[in-house]
Interface confidence: low
């Protein structure tokens, strides 16, 4: 029959070649010639001349070593022909398979394979994988199977099998418990890889573990008892820096220190917090501390980490024990700022208040006071008593020195310590208002129409406070009467000048009486240019026309 | 910043040779393998060579294998193609490549390719 | 040599619209030890190649969701569950399991 079954060829072979495979023969041949020939990729197409056949006896034939790896099979065609050329079967398919042979040592991908795994962690958890591959086959023999195995570990602590890899994955997992990265940070494993499913060639590579930092040890305090003396009355004093250890990685979260007070401070005098490059906790004055209240503080400080602990640790409690030193502290006026009211114009030497100083030291000291900010010089002190008197005339209208009707003065309290300390206290005068000025009309200059004049309207103005300003009251005088008109406003605050009888063109001067609410009267004379016009008239009287 | 700068293309007559150099900068490179890709004019992507992290393991398609070399220099943070015997259908752009990290050959990191023209 | 063929060549989209590109290879791209390293590149026009799956179906860091891999074995797909016009450009398909390592033929994806 005109068929071939497949031809088995293992790769490599040693010959001697040509190497007789298998006869192509034709049931045909009775009576006549059978001439065979076969084409193909590794016939008479690339790559040509692997394979040939005997022309007349049909028998196939192989020339050199067949590499698997590089073709793993040949698809040939067998033809018959007949002397005179016709072709006397239907081309045959002829397929070479190319069996494998172990002719390849499993390649690693990496030199270095690298991975990391917390320290800590249970076994069976996974660190990495390694790969190696082979270019053998794996299908149909165990020549490319790779079997993966650990061949050595470096360093064997807390012992020699932290590890184990599995055979057919190349996955690199923990088998023991005791990864500490403090006693090993890393470890070196020569991996091997062996073909044949671990029967055959080996390969190695190297596999490093780093094992990472877990928060497994806590900061403990170095020392754990500190004695600080600190000032009374500072605030933000470094009273004592802290010291801790931690094994754990340093400047990672798992060593960073966290401090809280967590006894001692009922007061809330004090704040803890952590140094970012020591590390130490930085233990200061949040308020100032009283030596006459409480000269010592005992405060208890706890250490944890940025990070939460891994496992169950204690936490670390340090001691700190804080002497208050006494200073001699400033007198402090009671209250630091006294609003007072003095009413304006009052006599040279009247007394407007009393403003004390207390001493908060326990030794009696003697207080002596002057005044260090008085702009107007309007007030004077008494240095024994703190009595403070008018020394001037206080003027509420005052507006260089006087801002919404106060007026600030600064006083100073000096004790008889060594060295003596001075406090300050502020006194704020509110100055009551008092009748002292009469209302004053703007402007003071008016310009009218003689023929159906308009009236002027002129602002009135009071420095003082009601009741002793507006309304106002206007009155003609000196008989200023007898040609003007003066009116005050319904509201009571602009009086209007107008003409009752012609005036030729002329400058003429207006007595104009004004009183405000509280009867104070102020005579202001108004200068009125009457213009030859009608109705209203602006700047200068106009130029009479000439006719030409 | 993770980056490769590859240098070294040109004009070269069939027969002839040139090296191809791939500037790493921005990672560990000794940790890494490599690779080296092209692609024709108006055609896909081929890959050439690749290179194990160490230097230990190299690997070709039968297309350049004898006459294409990749090597590495994890000093200078750089990786090579010596190219022998160059023929027309070597033409193409070459590109350099970083494996992603560990045992997988697949490429993250791609340089920004440099041009190899055969021709006489 | 493992052939990776990938189907259409040429794939008009519309933005908006879902897009799928099929690749399959001449035999199992599983490896030994249990991966199968296949994975999808984008060449943008004038840019290199940039990765953008890989183990089939894993988004490479900054690849936007609306991309996505599946398959096994010989098949493989690669979605994109809404097109826009920063995806086109020349798919490829990549194994990675066995050498030589092969890349499909390219899928070029353009707008409309």
């Known amino acids: 029959e005109w068929v071939m079954p497949p031809i088995f060829v293992p790769e490599n072979g040693k010959g001697p070649f040509p190497q007789r495979l298998n006869q192509l023969k034709s049931n045909k041949d009775r009576g006549t010639k059978i001439f065979y020939s076969i084409t193909g990729p590794g016939a008479d197409s690339p790559p040509e001349g692997v394979f040939t056949i005997e022309k007349e006896s049909g028998w196939l034939l192989l020339h050199m070593p067949l590499d698997r790896e590089k073709i793993v099979k040949y698809e040939l065609y067998g033809h018959a022909v007949s002397e005179n050329g016709a072709s006397v079967e239907e081309p045959m398919n002829i397929s070479i398979i190319v069996t494998d042979q172990n002719d390849n040592k499993p390649k690693f991908t990496q030199d270095t394979f690298r991975g990391s795994v917390l320290e800590g962690v249970m076994p069976g958890t996974s660190v990495m994988q390694v790969t190696a591959t082979d270019e053998d086959d794996a299908v149909n023999t165990y020549n490319g199977v790779v079997a993966y195995s650990i061949h050595s570990q470096e360093p064997k602590e807390p012992h020699d099998l932290m590890f184990t890899i599995h055979k057919s994955t190349g996955t690199i997992s923990v088998i023991s418990s005791g990864l500490d990265r403090e006693k090993v940070p890393e470890y070196r494993l020569t991996v091997q890889a062996t073909d044949m499913d671990g029967e055959g060639s080996t390969t190695t590579a190297e596999a490093v573990v780093q094992i990472l930092d877990a928060n497994d040890n806590a900061p403990e305090f170095e020392p754990q008892k500190y004695e600080a003396w600190v000032p009374e009355n500072e605030v933000g004093h470094e009273v004592q820096r802290l010291t801790v250890t931690d094994l754990d990685v340093p400047n990672s979260p798992a060593w960073r220190a966290t401090y809280h007070i967590v006894g001692g401070d009922d007061g809330d005098h004090f704040t803890i917090t952590t140094h970012p490059e020591t590390n130490q906790g930085v233990l200061t004055t949040k308020k100032g501390l009283d030596f006459e209240a409480q000269d010592q503080h005992t405060l208890y400080v706890e250490v944890t980490n940025e990070a939460p602990f891994a496992v169950k640790l204690p936490t670390a409690t340090a001691t700190v024990v804080v002497h208050v030193k006494d200073v001699n502290e400033a007198p402090v006026f009671v209250p630091p700022s006294k609003v007072i009211e003095a009413q304006e114009g009052i006599s040279i030497g009247e007394l407007v208040c009393i403003y004390t100083a207390q001493d908060p030291d326990k030794e009696d000291q003697k207080i002596s006071y002057t005044i260090s900010r008085d702009p107007a010089n309007w007030l004077a002190v008494d240095p024994d008593s703190g009595q403070i008197t008018a020394a001037g005339i206080l003027d509420r209208e005052d507006e260089q020195f006087v801002k919404n009707n106060v007026y600030e003065v600064m006083v100073l309290a000096t004790d008889s310590g060594n060295p003596p300390t001075t406090g300050t206290g502020t006194l704020l005068l509110t100055l009551t208002d008092i009748n002292d000025h009469g209302p004053i009309p703007e402007p003071r200059q008016i310009i009218i129409c003689n023929q159906s004049p308009v009236p002027q309207v002129l602002n009135i103005t009071d420095k003082d406070l009601s009741p002793n300003s507006s309304p106002f009251q206007a009155q003609l005088t000196h008989d200023s009467d007898i040609y003007w008109m003066a009116e005050v406003s319904e509201k009571g605050d602009t009086v209007a000048l107008s003409l009752k009888k012609f005036l030729k063109q002329d400058t003429y001067d207006l007595h104009l009486s004004l009183s405000d609410h509280g009867n104070r009267e102020q005579l202001t004379m108004i200068r009125a240019t009457v213009c030859d016009c009608h109705g209203q008239v602006f700047n200068d009287c106009p130029r009479p026309w000439k006719g030409g | 910043e993770v980056q490769l700068v590859q240098s070294g293309g040109g004009l070269v007559k069939p027969g002839g040779s040139l090296r191809l150099s791939c500037a790493a900068s921005?990672?560990?490179?000794?940790?890494?393998?490599m690779s080296w890709v092209r692609q024709a004019p108006g055609k896909g992507l081929e890959w050439v060579a690749t290179?194990?992290?160490?230097?230990?393991?190299?690997y070709y398609p039968d297309s350049v294998k004898g006459r294409f070399t990749i090597s590495r220099d994890n000093a200078k943070n750089s990786l090579y193609l010596q190219m022998n015997s160059l023929r027309a259908e070597d033409t193409a752009v070459y590109y350099c490549?970083?494996?992603?990290?560990?045992?997988?050959?697949?490429?993250?990191?791609w340089g920004q390719g440099t041009t190899v023209t055969v021709s006489s | 040599d493992i052939v990776m063929t990938q189907s259409p060549s040429s794939l008009p989209v519309t933005p908006g619209e879902p897009a799928s590109i099929s690749c399959r290879s001449s035999?199992?791209?599983?490896?030994?030890?249990?991966?199968?390293?296949l994975e999808w590149y984008l060449q943008k026009p004038g840019q290199s190649p940039q990765l953008l799956l890989y183990k089939v179906s894993n988004q490479f860091s900054g690849v936007p969701d609306r991309i996505s891999g599946s398959g096994s074995g010989t098949d493989f797909t690669l979605k994109i569950s809404r097109v826009e016009a920063e995806d086109v450009g020349v798919y490829y398909c990549?194994?990675?399991?066995?050498?030589?390592?092969?890349f499909g033929q390219g899928t070029k994806v353009e707008i409309k």
């Open positions: 490549a970083r494996h992603y990290y560990g045992s997988d050959w697949y490429f993250d990191v």
């Open positions: 990549f194994q990675g399991s066995h050498v030589p390592l092969t």
């Open positions: 035999q199992s791209i599983v490896q030994s030890n249990g991966n199968t390293y």
């Open positions: 921005g990672f560990t490179f000794s940790t890494y393998g």
């Open positions: 290179i194990s992290d160490g230097g230990s393991y190299t």
